[in-house]
C-alpha cells in the first residue's frame, strides 16, 4: 500500500491532497454540532453545493477556497444575551450553569472510573495471558521481543504501571536484567497510548470532530512509536539508557521514601472497587513462572485476610534437601526439615458486584469490558454535549484565547514547554496518562484544544506518569529500590529523549503531521480508524513476537524485506513530493500500482459489503450504540437518534456534491434545526453563561 | 502408661537365627517408630534399625543389613526382630524402643532381651 | 557415620554439685542431641531432646546446651539418684549413633 492512500499525482503540499484533507467545508458557525451533512471531505474545490433534499429553496454559491480542516470551529452562542434577561431569567440561568457544572464533574467521574474498570476489564480478559509473555526466556537477548511484549501487555492490561510493575518485580527476582527490561518499558509506553485512541473512537459520529479526537488522541501514539523506532536502535547500540541511569542510581544514597499521592484514585475507588476487585498480584506471578498462579482467579474475593507465620516439620528425600543444615534430622526411616509456612486466613469477603458469582476471569471480563465501554461512550457523549452547550461565545473565545495562544514575541518558543510542563504536573496530579489524555481527546474533538497545543500536553503527560514511578520506586521496599528507580528513571529519560528528538524543532514535530494524515484518513474512511487500532496495537506486535518465537533467522528474514519495502516507499514518496524529475515519468506518481494497493477505496468497498446488513437499515436504539453503527455503516444519519437510513442511496448519490453551509440561511435556529441538532424551541431556553 | 515387653533370654549357637518379640501397650502402636538398639560392654548402644508400624516401613543400619530383619503385626501390636548367622559378636542385650514423633529420639524403651551366642 | 565422642567415661560428684557431662560430634548436627540415662540395671531413659528440651517428668535441674557439635548435660544440685551411665546421641541423619557414655560416681 502507498504510503499516502490515494496518491494520483505527488504533489508538494501533501495536506492538501491527503483522502479527506481537500474538500472541507466552510466552518459552521455552530461548529460544535456539526454533522456529516455539512462535511463531505472528498469534494473538490470546484465542485457545486445544493442543499439537502429537505430545503424548499435552492441556493446556489460561487465556488469558495475551502476552509483548513484543522481550523478550530466557531462556538457560536446561540443563547439570549446575560444582558437581555430579566432577573428571573438571570436566577435560571446561574442554576442552569451550576447544574451544568455539576453534570459535567459528575459525567467526568464515571468517565475516569470507567476508565478504570476498562483497565481491570482488560486485565480479566487478558492478564494471564499478558503474565505468560513475560516468561517467555527469548526476552533477554531480543529487544524487538521485549518490546512488542511491552506493547502486547499493556494493550491487554490497559495499564502500564501494571506491566512496568511486573518487569520491576522481575527485575529484583534477577529474571530479567536491566538491558533486557528497557525494550518492554518502551513498548509499555506504546501501549499505553491505547487508551485514548479507543476514546476517540467514541467520537466517530461527527466527521470533523472524529478528524480532530482521532489525530489529538493518535499523536501520542506516532510520538511513542518514532521515539522507539530511533532509540531501541540506539539504546541496542550503545546502551545509553542503562548507562546513564545505573551512575544516577550508584551516585546517589536513596532512602525509602512515600508512597506518590494517590490523588485521583481516592475519589474513583470507592466506586471502582464496588464493581470489581482485583488481586493484581497474580498477573506478576504468572510472570515470574509460578505455577498455582495460572489457576488462580483475578477476581478479589477476601479483602480482609490474617497471615500467620507457622514452621512445620516436612520430610525430604535427603538431607541434602535441608532447608539448613540446623534444621535437619531424622526420625530413623524419614528425614526431616523444618519450613516456613505462611497460613492465610480469610476474615472478610470484598463487597464488590462479582464477589459471589464465581464467574470465570473471562465471563466478568467481558462483562466489565462492555458496561465499561458503553459507560466510558455515554460520559462521553454527554461530556461533550455539556461542553459544547457551554463552551460558547464569550466563554468559548476566553478559554480558547488562554489555551491556544502563544506568549508574546520573543517568548513565543516558552509556550509549548509551559504547555508540557501542564501536561506533567496534571498526570502527576490524575496518577495516570491515560486519564489525562483521555480527558484531552473529547476537547480536541470539539475544538477547544488545537493539536498543536495537545501535542506538548501529551508530551508532558508521558513525562507525569514517569514521576509518579519515580516516586513509587522511591517507596519500594529495599530489596527492590534499585531496579525499580532504574526502570523509572529509564522510562523517564526515554521519555526525555523522545521529546528532544520530535518537539523542540517545529520542523521535526513529525507525530503532528502523522496523526493529522490519519485524522484526515480517518474521517473519510472510519473503518479505518478501528483498522489502523487493530494493526498498530495488536498485528504488528503479535507478528514480530511470533517471528521471534520463530528464532533470529526468521525474524530477520522477513523483517529485512519488509523494512526495505518501507525505506523504499518513504524514499519514493519524498522525491515524488520535493523533486519529482529526477524520477523516471513512471514513478512519479503512484499509478503504476493496481488500486487496492494506493488507494483505500476498493478497500472500503469491501468494508461496506461486510457491513452491508448495518448500511441497509441502520437503526439504533440510543446514541451509545450510534456509534458502534457509525463506524460499521458509514451512514451520514446514524447519529440522530432512533432514525434510519431509509434513504441511503439517495444520501450516497448525493454524496460528492456538498451540502449548502448552514451560515447562508438566515436564522443559525433554523439551520440547526434542519441539521437535526436541536428542536426549532431549544435555542429559546439556551444559557451559556456560567 | 506406654509400655514395651520385650521376649526372654536366648541362648543359641553359632550360625542358627533367632527372632525376638516385643509387644507394645498404652499408645497408637501404628503411629510411632520402632526402634532396636544393642548393647554390648565393649561397643556401648549402637542403632540397629528402625520399622513404621504404618505401612511397614524400614530403615537399617548398614552394619546391621543383612543380620537384622524388622517386622510387624498390628493386630497384636508387637514388633519383631530376626537375628540370622549369628555369631559370638551378635551375644548382647537387644533393646526395642518406641521412637518420638517425627524424631530420632527413643522416648521409652523396652526391658531388654539378652541374647547368648555359645556353642 | 557421624561419631559421638563423651571424653570422660567416668566423672566423680558430690551430692549437691553441679556437673557437665560433654559430647562432641565428629560433624555438624545442628540441634539433633539426646540424652539418655541408665541406671544399673534398668533400661535407659530419654532426658533430653533438641539438644535443651526436657522430656516430660524429668526434673528440671538436668539442662542441656549446646549445637553443631559440642554439647553439653548440666545436672545442678546433683543427687543420689542420679547416679548412673549418661549418653548422648544424634539424628541428624542414619544411622543414629551414641555416645559410648559416661558413668557418674560419688567422691
Known amino acids: 500500500m502507498a504510503p499516502w492512500p490515494e496518491l494520483g499525482d505527488a504533489q508538494p503540499n501533501p495536506d492538501k491532497y491527503l483522502e479527506g484533507a481537500a474538500g472541507q467545508q466552510p466552518t459552521a458557525p455552530d461548529k460544535s454540532k456539526e454533522t456529516n451533512k455539512t462535511d463531505n471531505t472528498e469534494a473538490p474545490v470546484t465542485k457545486i453545493e445544493l442543499l439537502p433534499s429537505y430545503s424548499t429553496a435552492t441556493l446556489i454559491d460561487e465556488p469558495t477556497e475551502v476552509d483548513d480542516p484543522w481550523n478550530l470551529p466557531t462556538l457560536q452562542d446561540s443563547g439570549i444575551k446575560w444582558s437581555e434577561r430579566d432577573t428571573k431569567g438571570k436566577i435560571l440561568c446561574f442554576f442552569q450553569g451550576i447544574g451544568r457544572l455539576i453534570l459535567l464533574l459528575g459525567f467526568l467521574y464515571f468517565f475516569v472510573c470507567s476508565l478504570d474498570i476498562l483497565s481491570s476489564a482488560f486485565q480479566l480478559v487478558g492478564g494471564k495471558m499478558a503474565g505468560q509473555f513475560f516468561s517467555n526466556s527469548s526476552i533477554m537477548s531480543n529487544p524487538l521481543l521485549g518490546l512488542v511484549i511491552g506493547v502486547l501487555v499493556t494493550v491487554l492490561v490497559q495499564s502500564s504501571s501494571t506491566s512496568t510493575s511486573i518487569v520491576v518485580s522481575m527485575v529484583s527476582s534477577s529474571l530479567l536484567t536491566v538491558r533486557a527490561a528497557i525494550p518492554i518499558i518502551m513498548g509499555a509506553n506504546i501501549g499505553t497510548s491505547i487508551t485514548n485512541t479507543i476514546v476517540a473512537l467514541m467520537q466517530v459520529g461527527d466527521r470533523s470532530e472524529f478528524r480532530r479526537a482521532f489525530a489529538g488522541a493518535t499523536v501520542h501514539d506516532f510520538f511513542n512509536w518514532l521515539s522507539v523506532l530511533v532509540l531501541l536502535p540506539v539504546e541496542v547500540a550503545t546502551h545509553y539508557l542503562e548507562i546513564i541511569t545505573q551512575l544516577i542510581v550508584e551516585s546517589f544514597h536513596f532512602k525509602n521514601g512515600e508512597d506518590a499521592p494517590d490523588l485521583l484514585k481516592v475519589i474513583t475507588k470507592p466506586f471502582t472497587k464496588l464493581i470489581v476487585q482485583l488481586d493484581k498480584k497474580v498477573i506478576s506471578q504468572i510472570a515470574m513462572n509460578d505455577e498455582k498462579a495460572k489457576n488462580k482467579s483475578l477476581v478479589k474475593i477476601w479483602c480482609k485476610t490474617f497471615t500467620n507465620k507457622t514452621q512445620i516439620n516436612v520430610t525430604v528425600p535427603s538431607t541434602a534437601n535441608c532447608t539448613s543444615p540446623s534444621l535437619c534430622w531424622t526420625d530413623g526411616i524419614q528425614n526431616w526439615t523444618m519450613k516456613n509456612v505462611t497460613y492465610k486466613e480469610n476474615i472478610a469477603k470484598c463487597q464488590h458486584i462479582f464477589v459471589n458469582f464465581h464467574l470465570p476471569d473471562l465471563a466478568v471480563g467481558t462483562i466489565l469490558l462492555i458496561l465499561s465501554l458503553l459507560v466510558l461512550c455515554g460520559c462521553l457523549i454527554m461530556i461533550v454535549k455539556i461542553l459544547g452547550s457551554v463552551l460558547k461565545g464569550q466563554v468559548a473565545t476566553v478559554i480558547k484565547k488562554t489555551i491556544n495562544t502563544d506568549f508574546p514575541f520573543p517568548f513565543a518558543w516558552l509556550t509549548g514547554y509551559l504547555a508540557i510542563l501542564v501536561g506533567a504536573g496534571m498526570t502527576f496530579i490524575v496518577q495516570s496518562s491515560s486519564v489525562f489524555t483521555s480527558a484531552l481527546t473529547p476537547l480536541i474533538g470539539i475544538g477547544v484544544i488545537t493539536i498543536e497545543r495537545a501535542y506538548p500536553l501529551t508530551l508532558g503527560s508521558n513525562i507525569g506518569t514517569t514521576t509518579t514511578a519515580i516516586l513509587a520506586a522511591l517507596a519500594s521496599p529495599g530489596n527492590a529500590l534499585r531496579s525499580s528507580l532504574q526502570i523509572a528513571l529509564c522510562h523517564f529519560f526515554f521519555n526525555i529523549s523522545g521529546i528532544l528528538l520530535w518537539y523542540p524543532i517545529p520542523f521535526t514535530r513529525l507525530p503532528i503531521r502523522m496523526a493529522k494524515g490519519l485524522g484526515n484518513i480517518s474521517a473519510k474512511y472510519r473503518w479505518f480508524a478501528v483498522f489502523y487500532l487493530i494493526i498498530f496495537f495488536f498485528l504488528i506486535p503479535l507478528t514480530v513476537f511470533g517471528l521471534s518465537l520463530a528464532g533470529w533467522r526468521v525474524l530477520v528474514g522477513v523483517g529485512v524485506p519488509v523494512v526495505f519495502i518501507i525505506i523504499l516507499v518513504l524514499c519514493l514518496r519524498l522525491l515524488q513530493s520535493r523533486c519529482p524529475r529526477v524520477l523516471p515519468k513512471k514513478l512519479q506518481n503512484w499509478n503504476f500500482l493496481p488500486l487496492w494497493m494506493r488507494s483505500l477505496k476498493p478497500w472500503d468497498a469491501v468494508v461496506s459489503k461486510f457491513t452491508g446488513c448495518f448500511q441497509m437499515r441502520c437503526c439504533c436504539c440510543c446514541r451509545v450504540c450510534c456509534r458502534a453503527c457509525c463506524l460499521l455503516c458509514d451512514c451520514p444519519k446514524c447519529c440522530r437518534c432512533s432514525k434510519c437510513c431509509e434513504d441511503l442511496e439517495e444520501a450516497q448519490e448525493g454524496q460528492d456534491v456538498p451540502v449548502k453551509a448552514p451560515e447562508t440561511f438566515d436564522n443559525i435556529t433554523i439551520s440547526r434545526e434542519a441539521q437535526g441538532e436541536v428542536p426549532a424551541s431549544d435555542s429559546k431556553t439556551e444559557c451559556t453563561a456560567l | 502408661q506406654v509400655q514395651l515387653q520385650q521376649s526372654g533370654a536366648e541362648l543359641v549357637r553359632p550360625g542358627a537365627s533367632v527372632k525376638m518379640s516385643c509387644k507394645a501397650s498404652g499408645y497408637t502402636f501404628a503411629s510411632y517408630n520402632m526402634h532396636w538398639v544393642k548393647k554390648t560392654p565393649r561397643q556401648g548402644l549402637e542403632w540397629i534399625g528402625a520399622i513404621y508400624p504404618g505401612n511397614g516401613n524400614t530403615s537399617y543400619n548398614q552394619k546391621f543389613k543383612g543380620k537384622a530383619t524388622l517386622t510387624v503385626d498390628k493386630s497384636s501390636s508387637t514388633a519383631y526382630m530376626q537375628l540370622s548367622s549369628l555369631t559370638s559378636e551378635d551375644s548382647a542385650v537387644y533393646f526395642c524402643?518406641?521412637?518420638?514423633?517425627?524424631?530420632?529420639?527413643?522416648?521409652?524403651w523396652g526391658q531388654g532381651t539378652s541374647v547368648t551366642v555359645s556353642s | 557415620d557421624i561419631v559421638m565422642t563423651q571424653s570422660h567415661k567416668f566423672m566423680s560428684t558430690s551430692v549437691g554439685d553441679r556437673v557437665s557431662i560433654t559430647c562432641k560430634a565428629s560433624?555438624?548436627?545442628?540441634?539433633?542431641v539426646a540424652w539418655y540415662q541408665q541406671k544399673p540395671g534398668q533400661s535407659p531413659k530419654l532426658l533430653i531432646y533438641w539438644a535443651s528440651t526436657r522430656h516430660t517428668g524429668v526434673p528440671d535441674r538436668f539442662t542441656g546446651s549446646g549445637s553443631g557439635t559440642d554439647f553439653t548435660l548440666t545436672i545442678s544440685n546433683v543427687q543420689s539418684e542420679d547416679l548412673a551411665d549418661y549418653f548422648c546421641?544424634?539424628?541428624?541423619?542414619?544411622?543414629?549413633?551414641f555416645g559410648a557414655g559416661t558413668k557418674l560416681e560419688l567422691k
Open positions: 524402643v518406641r521412637g518420638g514423633r517425627g524424631l530420632g529420639t527413643m522416648d521409652y
Open positions: 560433624q555438624d548436627v545442628g540441634s539433633s
Open positions: 546421641q544424634h539424628y541428624r541423619n542414619i544411622p543414629l549413633t
